[in-house]
Structures are given as structure tokens and as C-alpha cells.
């Protein structure tokens, strides 16, 4: 399987709410013996490879901001932590995979990460994870709502989200 | 904070079943993988096994056809069973908090099980 | 299953030098790999995962390097706290092992 960003870089304003989304792709192994482990965190674009470093986000490690289920199913993070910090990670029955973040502020401008373990209980552990920028502005110059932009290099067109 | 406790008794006699238990403190033992790793006087780690709270598990080979890791999310424990244990089979005996594609990041203090007659 | 190495097993260092240990897979275990600091009577405490990120709070003076097969755990200054086994661990796959471990111990 592959993990899919549909949007590499997210512009928002101060104050707004963003919904940052990977997708899984490509058959999904729904056995007893397999499960998922999917998270998040911040990073930057290291020296070894994108991604390879995990700092938290807003105080919150990748440990408190993961989903860890078998197949499709669906999950939420642990509320009351994660929203105590305007956080909330979602994955649903389709294999979208997704954080939300609450009231932006400059601080939370930077590199995310999507990070999602295939567990094969008595082999190995399968590792992917998908990239996004997202830039908070402030100012006469920041857009009203937050504008996403596709990462496939052939619909360039921006994509403003609801 | 999460904290792990190791808890059974410290002599079993040879051929008998070891039994610890490992008891989740400070956090849900609904996530993760929960593992049990040993290590013999003077001697290196050896990963055991673990189970996820789902209920799956994985053993290490060389201890499988001997080795059942089980799970209480009411209670938040997990225990280890190891059947016909021999003296190669005393050590300090750790439970640990396994994340997946991370590291064992919690362990418990550690119990040392002796198999003696 | 994946067999670790760690070189040298004793390793006698004075404190505020540099202390280099080496650990060498049997096979590629791309930079899935972890150490561990053990100290007498204590349980292990993760230092390193991924080859090269501290966890959690350990000090910057460890650091971690290497892909593939061959990986450094360095400790640019020893502290006299650092005297202790240090083992490395990898989980690209299962059976999760452990190397043998090096003994940093004071000269």
C-alpha cells in the first residue's frame, strides 16, 4: 500500500481551523494477524530522508496523537488530550487519515507528517508516510480562508477549502 | 505517566509454568503493544513477545511452542506464561510498552524469576 | 532471525572523553534501529530510535548514526552517569532482537 497527500501545502490564515489529510492507497490487508498504526507529527526536510525526524505537535508526541486499529476500521485520538491542545486525528472506513487544528497561530507554520505502520503480527512492520507544508499568515497579505494546493503536478489549480 | 508493574513469584520449579503479570498505570493499555522481554544474570535482552490489545500477538520463535501472552483491557494488565520452564530460564523479566515503529520507550522496573527445586 | 553485534564488549573510558560504540547487523535493517542505556539493578531506558533521534529528553551529547548494517552510538562527553551497557536493538523485522551489549565502565 502507499500513502497519498492530495494537498502538499496548505496557506491559512490566523485564528482558522485546518483539516490536514493523507490517504492510504492500494489494497489494505484486512486479516486477524494485520493491524494499523497511523500518527503525526512535525518535522523537516533532514540530510537522511523527509520526515525521518518526529518533533510534536503542539506539545503532543506522535504517541499521543495515534490511531491504532485493525483494517478499514474507523478511530478517533484520545479527546480530552488532543482537543485540550485544539487537536483532534480522524481515520475513517475508506482510508482517508486526517488532523485537524484548531484557532492557527504563526507557531503552527512548518513541515507535517502522516505516518502509517502495517502490522504483520508475525513478520514485519511496513512503514510509509506522506508530507505537507502548511504556512499560517497574518496580515493584509494572508487569505480570508485556507487555500490548499494539490500535490499532483498536473492539477495545479488552488483549491480553496470549505 | 504512564508506569508498568511487574508482579508474580520470584521461584518456580523446573518443568512448572512461570506466571507474571504486568499492570498499565497512568495511561490506556488500549493502544500499543505490550511486551515482555527478559534478560539472564549477566547476560543480553531477549524479546519474549508481545500482544496488542486487540487480542493479537507474536512470540519469538525459539520461545513460541512454550510462550502465551495474554491481555485484561478491564483490568489494564497483561500477563506472560512460560510452560516447562528450566534453570535457562531464570532471569529478570520486563515488561514494556512497544510502540510501532518507534522503540520499547516504558519499561517496568523488572522481577527476577528463579527456576530452582 | 537478524543477529546484532556490538563492538567492543568493555569499552574503559575516562570522564569527558569521547565514547564510540559500534553495532553491526547480519543483514540490512534500513535505520529501524534503537539504543538503550542499562544501568546495575535499573531497566533499560531508550536513548536513540530511527539510527539517529533522541527520545525524549536525553541529553544531546548521545548521538546516533548509520543505515544499513553498520551503526554509532556516540557520547561526545562521558558523564559519570554514562558509565553503563549499552545495547542496540532493531525492529525492521520480527523476531525484534538485541545486540550483546558494550559496557562503558570508568578507566
Known amino acids: 500500500f502507499k500513502v497519498a497527500t492530495p494537498y502538499s501545502l496548505y496557506v491559512c490564515p490566523e485564528g482558522q481551523n485546518v483539516t490536514l489529510t493523507c490517504r492510504l492507497l492500494g489494497p489494505v490487508d484486512k486479516g486477524h494477524d494485520v493491524t494499523f498504526y497511523k500518527t503525526w507529527y512535525r518535522s523537516s526536510r533532514g540530510e537522511v530522508q523527509t520526515c525521518s525526524e518526529r518533533r510534536p505537535i503542539r506539545n503532543l508526541t506522535f504517541q499521543d496523537l495515534h490511531l491504532h486499529h485493525g483494517g478499514h476500521q474507523a478511530a478517533n485520538t484520545s479527546h480530552d488530550l488532543a482537543q485540550r491542545h485544539g487537536l483532534e486525528s480522524a481515520s475513517d472506513h475508506h482510508g482517508n487519515f486526517s488532523i485537524t487544528m484548531r484557532n492557527l497561530t504563526l507557531l503552527d507554520s512548518g513541515l507535517y507528517c502522516c505516518l502509517v505502520v502495517e502490522i504483520r503480527h508475525h513478520h514485519s512492520e511496513h512503514r510509509v508516510h506522506g508530507a505537507m507544508e502548511l504556512q499560517v499568515q497574518t496580515g493584509k497579505d494572508a487569505p480570508s480562508n485556507c487555500v490548499v494546493y494539490p500535490s499532483s503536478s498536473q492539477d495545479s489549480e488552488n483549491i480553496t477549502a470549505a | 505517566q504512564v508506569q508498568l508493574q511487574e508482579s508474580g513469584p520470584g521461584l518456580v520449579k523446573p518443568s512448572e509454568t512461570l506466571s507474571l503479570t504486568c499492570t498499565v498505570s497512568?495511561?490506556?493499555?488500549?493502544?500499543?503493544?505490550w511486551s515482555w522481554i527478559r534478560q539472564p544474570p549477566g547476560k543480553g535482552l531477549e524479546w519474549i513477545g508481545y500482544?496488542?490489545?486487540?487480542?493479537?500477538?507474536n512470540y519469538n520463535p525459539s520461545l513460541k511452542s512454550r510462550v502465551t501472552i495474554s491481555v485484561d483491557t478491564s483490568k489494564s494488565q497483561f500477563s506472560l506464561k512460560l510452560s516447562s520452564v528450566t534453570a535457562a530460564d531464570t532471569a529478570v523479566y520486563y515488561c514494556?510498552?512497544?510502540?510501532?515503529?518507534?522503540?520499547?520507550?516504558?519499561w517496568g522496573q523488572g522481577t527476577m524469576v528463579i527456576v530452582s527445586s | 532471525e537478524i543477529v546484532l553485534t556490538q563492538s567492543p564488549a568493555t569499552l574503559s573510558l575516562s570522564p569527558g572523553e569521547r565514547a564510540t560504540l559500534s553495532c553491526r547487523a547480519s543483514q540490512s535493517v534500513s535505520y529501524y534501529l534503537a539504543w538503550y542505556q542499562q544501568k546495575p539493578g535499573q531497566a533499560p531506558r531508550l536513548l536513540i530510535y530511527d539510527a539517529f533521534n533522541r527520545a525524549t529528553g536525553i541529553p544531546a551529547r548521545f548521538s546516533g548514526s548509520g543505515s544499513g548494517t553498520d551503526f554509532t552510538l556516540t557520547i561526545s562527553s562521558l558523564e559519570p552517569e554514562d558509565f553503563a551497557v549499552y545495547y542496540c536493538?532493531?525492529?525492521?523485522?520480527?523476531?525484534?532482537?538485541f545486540g550483546g551489549g558494550t559496557k562503558v565502565e570508568i578507566k
Open positions: 536493538q532493531q525492529r525492521i523485522n520480527w523476531p525484534l532482537t
Open positions: 514494556a510498552r512497544d510502540i510501532p515503529a518507534f522503540a520499547f520507550d516504558i
Open positions: 500482544i496488542h490489545y486487540s487480542g493479537s500477538t
Open positions: 497512568g495511561g490506556s493499555i488500549s493502544s500499543y503493544h
